[in-house]
């Protein structure tokens, strides 16, 4: 049995898969910040995790996915306010009893040192210095991401 948050995450992922593929994003849109091969957008309001997830999708983006410790540190370096927490795209899957990214992959236990419990209705937030497990209903800010995907020239065989 999936929780409402897991259902919401799956629905958004499926609808994203159904949409026609867009050309690659070469530069970050206005208001977005570039971090390596990603564009990040920091919210200026607060929401529970599932509303944050949905709001990123309205920007044709997703909640932030963090590949490794190095990317976490670089992202945290962009956070200017000490005490502010931001949702990222990671929540606890009750059915699999594990932290699960919204793209369906599981957290590599070495990637993030999470403060707090791994339990039902827990979602992950980051601050300038730490990574926290919070109740998904907590209302905090969030970070959306778009991948920068340089367009490669297609080579067509002679007709």
């Amino acid at each position: 049995q999936k929780s409402s948050i897991e259902k919401c995450s799956v629905d958004i992922q499926q609808s994203r898969n159904k949409t026609t593929e867009r050309p690659g994003l070469l530069n970050c849109p206005i208001y977005w910040q570039q971090l390596r091969e990603k564009c990040l957008l920091f919210s200026h309001t607060v929401n529970p995790w599932n509303n944050s997830l949905a709001d990123c999708s309205t920007k044709e983006s997703s909640l932030l996915l963090i590949r490794d410790k190095d990317e976490l540190i670089h992202t945290q370096n962009l956070i200017r306010d000490k005490a502010i927490l931001f949702w990222i795209g990671l929540n606890f899957s009750l059915s699999e009893k594990n932290w699960k990214w919204i793209n369906g992959s599981f957290l590599n236990s070495n990637d993030l040192e999470i403060r707090g419990d791994a339990k039902e209705n827990s979602c992950i937030s980051i601050s300038q210095t730490s990574v926290y497990s919070e109740y998904c209903s907590t209302e905090i800010r969030w970070i959306c991401q778009k991948e920068l995907t340089p367009v490669r020239n297609k080579v067509y065989p002679d007709s």
């Epitope: 208001y31 920091f42 200026h44 607060v46 509303n51 800010r141």
Partner: antibody, heavy 120, light 107 residues
């Protein structure tokens, strides 16, 4: 047409509390975050805090955390700010102001302001 | 807290003149700066967002520029209705802060 209609001027005694209202019309009330701003001496502007009308989530400027309480009534599309334990320092014009975008901190529509005078 | 300083509290100009209103941030705020106009007895009205993007319906005589710590609002040809206070605001941090305002007076 977007409008934010605030309650009228108030004269209150030191130590009292009071609540200012801000009735929104012309847009989806739950779709935009509401902010409150204090203007002292006709000039100095200070951001007090925000409330997400859809969820009731709030975030305050630490300076006003014990001074202001933000709430909303979705059924009447009205935001409220209660000011507590008033002193002469709280005499000012208070504005509600709509956040223009979830991802940028600017205010695209403002109420007409509510003048608060704290005096014995 | 980031302090936004508008060094000119008053500026006097004539109709048709070009005027530059400046604002200095105490630390780098990128382009997360807004300019507001407050005419006498009215509430503030947004003119410019993201340092240089004119808000919908704002006359093109208003132009914003700058990044980092130094920002300018330019009125290319002042009109009598531009008599107002002008405020800058930063949102680079979540504690939004405003400049002290510049009152534009028409000679």
């Amino acid at each position: 047409e977007v409008q934010l209609q605030q309650s009228g001027p108030e004269l209150v005694k030191p130590g009292a509390s009071m609540k200012i209202s801000c009735k929104a019309s012309g847009y989806s009330f739950t779709g935009y975050t509401m902010n409150w701003v204090k203007q002292s001496h006709g000039k100095n502007l200070e951001w007090i805090g925000l409330i997400n009308p859809n969820t009731g989530g709030t975030y305050y400027n630490q300076k006003f955390k014990d001074k202001a309480t933000l709430t909303v009534d979705k059924s009447s599309s009205t935001a409220y700010m209660e000011l507590l334990s008033l002193t002469s320092e709280d005499s000012a014009v208070y504005y509600c102001a709509r956040l223009g975008d979830n991802y940028r901190g600017y205010f695209d529509f403002w109420g007409q302001g509510t003048t608060l005078t704290v005096s014995s | 807290d980031i302090v936004m300083t508008q060094s000119h509290k008053f500026m006097s100009t004539s109709v048709g003149d070009r005027v530059n209103i400046t604002c200095k941030a105490s630390q780098d705020v990128g382009t997360a700066v807004v300019w507001y106009q407050q005419t006498p007895g009215q509430s503030p009205k947004v003119l410019i967002d993201w340092a240089s993007i004119r808000h919908t319906g704002v006359p093109d005589r208003f132009t914003g520029s700058g990044s980092g710590t130094d920002f300018t609002l330019t009125i290319s040809s002042v009109q009598s209705e531009d008599l107002a206070d002008y405020f800058c605001q930063q949102y680079s941090t979540y504690l939004y802060t405003f400049g002290g305002g510049t009152k534009l007076e028409i000679k």
